[in-house]
Each structure stands twice: as structure tokens, then as C-alpha cells.
């Protein structure tokens, strides 16, 4: 865990950052420069050397561990994303299959995320319908597993390979939204050429009992006309603006180093005309192909 890594002192970390800046500069003896900077800094602190830490004896403060655990376990404390993409379930015709206390719900999503965006988080939101006798106070205890249906390659067309994306136990007393983290899958989908992806939701009884009236039933609402249609939400960051800024900086540096380039009349601050338009065109193509399904 990042908090446990206390062996490198903050000063050394900062020095290593300086290393990145200076190491590529010609004519600078970086080690000498680093040593002299270090000596000067230590002199101001009235120290002869960087104090050593015995990592075995150093325990992080309790509040730091709590903070780490909060961010490690609380998915809602995600870094801010500046783009939100939502995709509705496109499989409007398949019905859930049920046998031996297991119910299977097929879902289909047409997902398209430009390659220059970084996917921060992705979640599948499912509305769970708890159906039980109102006289019975107990809730419904179920295991939900989200599978990705992988494309079959080669001869075995009939076989379906499935990959578990996420699973969890749900104890429900009321119908409500449940959220499942599918970030890794979406990052894979972004890299793949394909835009159509099939998921399957499995709901099984926790205690191997077949569902009956007394134990109640848990279902996923997949009705197309319903406000509770399964939703895939992708939180992403547009890195193109960062990339543009880096390119601008690189341009400025190269202009500094090679003044003769200025004569070419290059405008380092003009952005390429096409990316946004191309993305929009691509989106429109996707729209054309999926709108028919929607209608």
C-alpha cells in the first residue's frame, strides 16, 4: 500500500523529480549539482545528513490509514471526471432465463469511447426489484454476478466463453439501484475495435434454496420503456487538452533551440481542425447504426 512505503524520504523523492528535469540537459554534472543543493539545504536545517528512518519502527498514523482505507474501499470518492458517457441496454427482446434458483439476464451495450480519453471509472447500474410477501419482514439474500460474454473465435461457434467481471452479495428489503464497478472491462473495450458488447447478469439464491414465495424474489428490471433500464456509465477525462498543452510547450522549446524554424511560419497555438469533427462524425455513424435499434 502507498502509505506503507516510508523508506524513501520526501527529500529524496523531490530530488528524484529534479533528476527528471536536469538529466537530459547537456553540460550539467547532475550529481555534483544535486549534492551541492542537498548540502546547502541540510546546512540550513543544521543537519549533516538526511535523518535515517527505520522503516520497521515507523507506523503510519491511524488517521492516515483510515483515509487510505476510505479511498481504497469507498468507490464514491473517485477522482473527478470531466466527461460522462451513458449507454442504455440495447437488448430489448431477450427474456431472462430461469432454472434451479438461477436467473440469467442478457444485456447488450454499444460502447464507443475515443482513444484519447482516459477512463477513470465505469459502473453498471441495475435496478433490483424485490418481490416478496408484504407480510414477511425478511429481506432477500442473493448473489449477483456480472459476466462478459466473450466473442467466440474459430470453430466453436456454439460455445460461449464468459468472463466474470464483478460479483457481490445483495441483501435487499426494497427495490433499489445497485452499482457494479466494471472499469477494467470498459478500459479493455476502449482498446478493442469492437463497439458491441454483451453482458450477462446472474442472480442466484445464497443458501441453495430454490426461490419460493416465502423467500421472495429478486429480479433485474430490464424493460425498455422503463425508467429503470440498466445503465452503463463511463466517467472519463479528456486528455487531448493536456496533450495540446504539452505539444505547445514542446513547440516553444524547439523554437527556442532552433530559431530558424520561426521562418517557416508555424503557429504553435493552432489546434488541428479535425479531431472534434472526426469524433462527431464517428459518433454520428454510431448513431445511424443504433438509432434503428432504438426505434
Amino acid at each position: 500500500s502507498p502509505i506503507m512505503n516510508l523508506e524513501q524520504s520526501p527529500l529524496e523523492e523531490d530530488m528524484s523529480l529534479f533528476g527528471d528535469v536536469f538529466s537530459e540537459q547537456d553540460g550539467v554534472d547532475f550529481n555534483t549539482l544535486l549534492q551541492s543543493m542537498k548540502d546547502e539545504f541540510l546546512k540550513t536545517l543544521n543537519l549533516s545528513d538526511i535523518p535515517t528512518q527505520d522503516s520497521a519502527k515507523v507506523d503510519p498514523p491511524e488517521y492516515m490509514l483510515e483515509l487510505y482505507n476510505k479511498f481504497a474501499t469507498d468507490r464514491t470518492s473517485m477522482p473527478s471526471a470531466n466527461i460522462i458517457r451513458s449507454f442504455k441496454n440495447e437488448d430489448l427482446f431477450s427474456q431472462p432465463v430461469s432454472f434451479n434458483g438461477l436467473r440469467k439476464y442478457p444485456l447488450l451495450f454499444n460502447v464507443s469511447i475515443p482513444h484519447h480519453e482516459e477512463v477513470i471509472m465505469a459502473e453498471l447500474r441495475l435496478y433490483t426489484l424485490v418481490q416478496r410477501d408484504r407480510m414477511i419482514y425478511d429481506g432477500v439474500d442473493r448473489k449477483i454476478t456480472i459476466f462478459e460474454v466473450l466473442e467466440s473465435k474459430g470453430d466453436n461457434e456454439g460455445e460461449r466463453n464468459m468472463l466474470v467481471l464483478v460479483s457481490g452479495e445483495i441483501y435487499g428489503t426494497n427495490s433499489e439501484w445497485e452499482t457494479f464497478d466494471v472499469t477494467d472491462a470498459i478500459r479493455r473495450w476502449q482498446k478493442s475495435g469492437s463497439s458491441t458488447h454483451q453482458l450477462e447478469v446472474h442472480i442466484e439464491s445464497k443458501h441453495d434454496e430454490a426461490e419460493d414465495a416465502s423467500s421472495g424474489r429478486l429480479e433485474i428490471d430490464t424493460s425498455a420503456q422503463n425508467k429503470h433500464n440498466p445503465l452503463l456509465i463511463v466517467f472519463s477525462d479528456d486528455q487531448s487538452s493536456d496533450k495540446e498543452r504539452k505539444e505547445e510547450l514542446n513547440e516553444m522549446i524547439s523554437h527556442e533551440q532552433l530559431p530558424e524554424l520561426d521562418n517557416l511560419g508555424l503557429d504553435s497555438f493552432s489546434s488541428g481542425p479535425g479531431e472534434e469533427a472526426l469524433l462527431q462524425m464517428r459518433s454520428n455513424i454510431i448513431y445511424d447504426s443504433t438509432a434503428r435499434i432504438r426505434r
Epitope: T76, N82, I84, R85, S86, I233, D238, I286
Partner: antibody, heavy 126, light 112 residues
Framework: SLEESGGDLVKPGASLTLTCTAS?????????ICWVRQAPGKGLEWIAC????????TYYASWAKGRFTVSKTSSPTVTLQMTSLTAADTATYFC????????????????????WGPGTLVTVSS | DIVMTQTPASVEAAVGGTVTIKCQAS??????LAWYQQKSGQPPKLLIY???TLESGVPSRFKGSGSGTEFTLTISDLECADAATYYC??????????????FGGGTEVVVK
């Protein structure tokens, strides 16, 4: 950050242009700039949004169409032109950055407002 | 146009207590709802978007739930700093009716 300017005391029937200036980030295709107002002691009221990318897509509240015009001038500024002002337009006007939402069918639109300016006061009085 | 109705207009609770604010949309807006906190003389601050997603840096004491037309903001373990006015906002797009945004009337939270 965002900062509004141009707020003033004007007479009924007058026109006024407010400016929203962004600093610390440049306008890009991944968000919207929106205007929201708040009359003294009252709630928030959405006015309009403009896409910060290269195309000029705008959305207006139905009550604001015709009298209010949002436009991008030179980056990084967005203006809100207001005409035929009345006492009911007296309010603090905020500009806000709207998150960029896309639905699966390639329609994109402003979402929640995750960055706000401090506001500028417009007073309409004779 | 979508109309957002927020209740109650004002609520009072003790430090450490819990406050629940409700917001009702005049038509279904799926999960496209945000919650803001506004203190006197300041601009609003985003707390929650997409009905239940916590904005970066906002304490997990703030919890949003709901979808369609009924939404709830719950503030638990109330602190004095939570005294403010809270607003819900819908931001709904449909290819048939275009885009619209609307705020609720606000709920003043008083912390004793």
C-alpha cells in the same frame, strides 16, 4: 477558476452584457459554460449554456429565449447579452462550468455544474 | 419544461444528527440529477451528480439516491459547517424534447 464581470445598476428597458472569464484552464471541447442567476433571497435559476468546443451549440431556458443571448467571444471568455431588462431581472448572475455528458447515441449536452464563479450583481431600477 | 419540487423548505437538526431532503421531478429524468450546497454570500458547490455519485473531495456523509422522479439527499453525522441551503438540479436531454435544466426551490438546513 471562473469570474464574472459587467454587473451594474441599469434602468428598466436597458441592455447589459456580462462576461465570464476562465483562468487556470483553457476552453476545450470537453465542457460547457453556463449562466445561472439568483434573485436576492431567492433560489437558483438556470438561464443558458454554450458548448466550449469549436461548434456553437447553445441551450436556453424557455423563459430566456429571445431576451438573453450567450456567445463565445475570444477564448477564454463567454458573454451573456441581456435586453429589455426589468426589475424581475435583478439578481446575482453566476457563470458555471458544465460537465460534458454524452448519451449512447452521440448527443452531447451539459450536465452538473462543477465549477462556479463568485457572481456579479445586476440591479434593474429606475 | 421540467419542474423540480424540493421539500422541506427548511429543516432543523442537531449536531451529529441526520437530515433528509427530497426532490421530485415533474417527469422522469433517469439519474440526471445533481445536489448543491450554498452558503450565504458564496456560489453553490457541487456535492453529488448522477443522483448518487459523490463529487471529488465531498465527505461521504453526503449521500444521494433515487431515480426517475423521486430523489433524496441524506446528510448524516451533521456538523455545524453543514448549515447552508441545498438545491437539487435536473439536467435532462432527450432527442425529442432537447435539453433542459431546472433547480429545486432550495432547502435551508439549520444545525443546532
Amino acid at each position: 477558476s471562473l469570474e464574472e464581470s459587467g454587473g451594474d445598476l441599469v434602468k428598466p428597458g436597458a441592455s447589459l452584457t456580462l462576461t465570464c472569464t476562465a483562468s487556470g484552464f483553457s476552453f476545450s471541447s470537453s465542457y460547457w459554460i453556463c449562466w445561472v442567476r439568483q434573485a436576492p433571497g431567492k433560489g437558483l435559476e438556470w438561464i443558458a449554456c454554450i458548448y466550449a468546443g469549436s461548434s456553437d451549440i447553445t441551450y436556453y431556458a424557455s423563459w430566456a429565449k429571445g431576451r438573453f443571448t450567450v456567445s463565445k467571444t475570444s477564448s477564454p471568455t463567454v458573454t451573456l447579452q441581456m435586453t429589455s431588462l426589468t426589475a424581475a431581472d435583478t439578481a446575482t448572475y453566476f457563470c458555471a462550468r458544465g460537465r460534458y455528458y454524452v448519451d449512447g447515441y452521440a448527443d452531447y449536452y451539459p450536465g452538473d455544474f462543477n465549477l462556479w464563479g463568485p457572481g456579479t450583481l445586476v440591479t434593474v431600477s429606475s | 419544461d421540467i419542474v423540480m419540487t424540493q421539500t422541506p423548505a427548511s429543516v432543523e437538526a442537531a449536531v451529529g444528527g441526520t437530515v433528509t431532503i427530497k426532490c421530485q421531478a415533474s417527469q422522469s429524468i433517469s439519474s440526471y440529477l445533481a445536489w448543491y450546497q450554498q452558503k450565504s454570500g458564496q456560489p453553490p458547490k457541487l456535492l453529488i451528480y448522477l443522483a448518487s455519485t459523490l463529487e471529488s473531495g465531498v465527505p461521504s456523509r453526503f449521500k444521494g439516491s433515487g431515480s426517475g422522479t423521486e430523489f433524496t439527499l441524506t446528510i448524516s453525522d451533521l456538523e455545524c459547517a453543514d448549515a447552508a441551503t441545498y438545491y437539487c438540479q435536473s439536467y435532462y436531454y432527450s432527442s425529442s424534447s432537447s435539453y433542459g435544466s431546472a433547480f429545486g426551490g432550495g432547502t435551508e438546513v439549520v444545525v443546532k
